[in-house]
């Protein structure tokens, strides 16, 4: 599995999607959890309703909620309120009995907000993550940009 | 009972070469990443590089790159370390340490080093 | 190279002490920083990782904290057996990279 970036705003929302294969995973309880190290047992933080015809209602687990598109095939994730500590690998999974197949891998990073002027000499413009050199980068920032205001991170 | 284990103290003449070795017990070492760690007498610790035992994937520090050659043998559960030319810069304690890689790793298992000691 | 500074490089406290370590990168490493604690003859052994988080068995007066490019060490009511070397390491990207070290000493 190639990993997918996803960049978020400190203090902001980010949304993480997953698209699967609907009928591949017709039936199936999704779940987001949080991996310990690239090689690393992967700890559950939330999953899908366990009815999985309601699968479509946001579940919460303290800052993160999932939700399933189960006919569309995309599973999202939200973190609210984006922290530091958020930062780190990831996997969307779809669940069969005891096993998990992985949909996606995700690396989060979390950019200081650049309206935060407690942080304007310490803001993080991203250049190459040398572990995932090969990793597609979201950007996925929910804040909408003010009136004459440079978008960030730049974008190359 | 988790452990890395590492080969004894090496007294080895300067332009020689020398070979540590690692093994792993209670763990595979397949499941881990092997990295080297330099220490000079009386120094800080310099990070040499790591190898995937999973598939022979190694990343150099740059300074290390053509000094180590990093190698793995499942097999054995064994990871070793290979330095060429040595000099006097080269007299350190080595370190092998095991984790789960970048991006918060709990895992965290170390040697008790390797003594290599460069003579003129 | 992200560069890892290191301060101070030797301390002298008291026991009973808070003693306080930081940790400033050269770039923006999110949290991946580790703090390893060093005795002689020993091998390091790891003490925080993900900038603020306890690993299996440190006693719970060593903490750490920051994000971004600065980070601290701290420990509350020094012990003879914190009498060591303290070293903080990078993860953002390799070469991983450690800071010079800093010893602690009872006065």
């Known amino acids: 599995h190639n990993t997918t970036v996803f960049q978020g705003v400190a203090g902001q929302s980010l949304q993480v999607s997953c698209p699967y294969d609907s009928m591949k995973h017709w039936g199936r309880r999704k779940a987001w959890c949080r991996q310990l190290g690239e090689k690393g047992p992967c700890q559950r933080v939330v999953s899908t309703h366990n009815l999985w015809l309601l699968s479509f209602l946001r579940r919460w687990n303290g800052s993160t909620a999932i939700t399933d598109d189960t006919l569309g095939g995309t599973l999202t994730i939200t973190l609210r309120n984006l922290q530091p500590h958020d930062a780190g690998l990831y996997q969307c999974q779809s669940l069969h009995g005891s096993e998990a197949d992985t949909l996606r891998k995700v690396l989060v990073e979390v950019l200081a907000d650049p309206l935060d002027h407690r942080d304007a000499g310490d803001l993080w413009f991203p250049g190459e993550s040398e572990s995932f050199e090969d990793a597609h980068v979201e950007h996925s920032i929910s804040r909408s940009l003010l009136e004459g205001e440079i978008p960030f991170p730049p974008t190359s | 009972e988790v452990q890395l284990q590492q080969s004894g103290a090496e007294l080895v003449r300067s332009g020689a070469s020398v070979k540590l070795s690692c093994t792993a017990s209670?763990?595979?070492?397949?499941?881990?990443?092997i990295h080297w760690v330099k220490q000079r007498p009386e120094q800080g610790l310099e990070w040499i590089g790591w190898?995937?035992?999973?598939?022979?994937?190694?990343k150099y520090a740059p300074k290390f790159q053509g000094k180590a050659t990093m190698t793995a043998d499942t097999s054995s559960n064994t990871a070793y370390l290979h330095l060429s030319s040595l000099t006097s810069e080269d007299t350190a304690v080595y370190y092998c340490?095991?984790?789960?890689?970048?991006?918060?790793?709990?895992?965290?298992?170390w040697g008790q080093g390797t003594s290599v000691t460069v003579s003129s | 190279d992200i560069q890892m500074n290191q301060s101070p490089s030797s301390l002298s406290a008291s026991l009973g002490d808070t003693v306080t370590i930081t940790c400033h990168a050269s770039?923006?490493?999110?949290?991946?920083l580790s703090w390893y604690q060093q005795k002689p003859g020993d091998h390091p052994k790891l003490l925080i990782y993900k900038a603020s988080n306890l690993h299996t068995g440190v006693p719970s007066r060593f903490s750490g904290s920051g994000s971004g490019t600065g980070f601290t060490l701290t420990i509350s009511s020094l012990q003879p057996e914190d009498i060591a070397t303290y070293y903080c390491?990078?993860?953002?990207?390799?070469?991983?990279?450690f800071g010079g070290g800093t010893k602690l000493e009872i006065k």
């Open positions: 190898i995937d035992p999973e598939n022979g994937d190694s």
């Open positions: 340490h095991a984790d789960h890689g970048n991006y918060g790793s709990t895992m965290d298992y």
């Open positions: 209670g763990f595979s070492i397949e499941d881990f990443y």
């Open positions: 390491q990078q993860g953002q990207t390799y070469p991983r990279t």
């Open positions: 770039q923006h490493i999110n949290v991946w």
